[in-house]
């Protein structure tokens, strides 16, 4: 946020940039939280726009019994590894096909025993305030589906009749990581010393980090004809004086007619 200055007063202004503002020769360049000619005003809203999507990663291990382990499978650039990766990915795409949050799988390691597959199941959902619940539900469905397939697709008489067969007891979920996004925490942090006065309000499921000086929200402070200004002690209404009235009161809702006051003064003279 910048304000341009023209004329002789500019040099004077340069030394007066407040709140960490820097003079660029023309104007005060204000840090994120401030604006105004001297960076003297505190912004009333801070952009904490959430990410478009939130991701989760499940670390799983399954044991594939329909493939015999060979040394080539240790080498991720070998043709054998690439083929295994393709078949395993196709199989997992079928297993998880009913999960809208499912993105894919990423094999991290193959080891002996028929083939023990250490891999990540990748999940993603559009950001909404309920993203944690959505991803928690998706991880539960992943567990259900992989447990089901590794119980059903098993070798019979040393032969597999499915794309892949599994060892029922070899399925483990090691870890689940969900990208953390906490708009309240972000809002507090970005508001710095004004953190106590900034709150998160939602509109169309999007979080807005606002102070009571931002109009149009449930916490908005109504200063009537006055101006809302943020200070370290909270939001305050700066009341205006018009040609006909003085305004006062906490929300500038008390108007005093100037003519009455002047009339009173004349009466004293």
């Amino acid at each position: 946020r910048t304000t341009t200055c023209f004329g002789d007063g500019c040099q004077n202004t340069a030394s007066r940039c407040k709140n960490g503002g820097t003079w660029d020769g023309l104007k005060c360049q204000c840090p994120n939280l401030y604006y105004g000619e001297l960076c003297e005003e505190v912004v009333s809203s801070i952009d904490i726009g959430p990410p478009e999507t939130i991701s989760a990663q499940m670390e799983l291990t399954v044991t594939v019994t329909s493939v015999k382990f060979t040394e080539e499978l240790k080498n991720h650039s070998s043709q054998e590894f690439q083929e295994f990766k393709q078949t395993f990915t196709e199989q997992m795409n079928i297993v998880y096909s009913g999960i809208p949050e499912y993105v894919g799988v990423n094999i991290t390691k193959l080891r002996l025993g028929s083939v023990v597959v250490e891999h990540d199941v990748l999940l993603r959902t559009k950001y909404t305030p309920e993203y944690k619940t959505v991803l928690d539900n998706a991880t539960e469905v992943v567990k259900e589906k992989i447990t089901k397939v590794t119980t059903q697709q098993i070798m019979i008489n040393d032969i597999c009749s499915d794309m892949m067969c599994f060892n029922t007891t070899g399925t483990q979920v090691q870890n689940i990581t969900v990208t953390q996004y906490d708009p309240e925490e972000d809002c507090r942090k970005m508001a710095k010393e004004y953190g106590d006065y900034f709150v998160v309000e939602y509109r169309d499921q999007k979080p807005y980090c606002i102070s009571p000086c931002e109009p149009g929200f449930s916490v908005s402070k109504n200063c009537n004809l006055g101006k809302c200004q943020m200070s370290l002690s909270g939001p305050q209404c700066l009341c205006v004086t018009t040609e006909t009235h003085w305004y006062s009161g906490e929300t500038c809702n008390q108007g005093t007619q100037k003519s009455l006051v002047y009339g009173h003064h004349h009466h004293h003279h």
């Epitope: 329909s66 060979t70 043709q79 078949t87 070798m155 597999c160 794309m163």
Partner: nanobody, 123 residues
């Protein structure tokens, strides 16, 4: 690139024999799994016979004792000796391969395929 080319199909009388061949190029013949699948008109593709790099073989119940699978690693070739042929053996026979040591009869596990050769058993 792996290329599989089948040959040896044709018309044969019930009880007769045929030998199918599959020439594999670009495939490391001493590794992985090679197989014969077949598809009869209006039916799903089914696994017939399988051979692994160590010579381990397996067969579909319907052909056990009648069909023999073998591979010649030096010639990069796969064979299927079919004896005592029946009318129900009529199908297009496909050669399939995987670089992996597979123990599955499911066609989806095999990435490499030939074009197929027709076998008709009829009197």
């Amino acid at each position: 690139d792996v290329q599989l080319v089948e040959s040896g199909g044709g018309l044969v009388q019930p009880g007769g024999s045929l030998r199918l061949s599959c020439a594999a190029s670009g495939f490391p013949s001493s590794r992985g799994t090679m197989a014969w699948f077949r598809q009869a008109p209006g039916k799903e593709r089914e696994g017939v016979a399988f051979i692994n790099s160590d010579g381990r073989t397996s067969y579909a119940e319907s052909v056990k004792g009648r069909f023999t699978i073998s591979r010649d690693n030096a010639l990069s070739s796969l064979y299927l000796q079919m004896n005592s042929l029946r009318a129900e053996d009529t199908a297009v026979y496909y050669c399939a391969a995987s670089l992996l040591y597979l123990m599955t009869v499911n066609a989806a596990a095999y990435p490499y395929w030939g074009q197929g050769t027709m076998v008709t058993v009829s009197s």
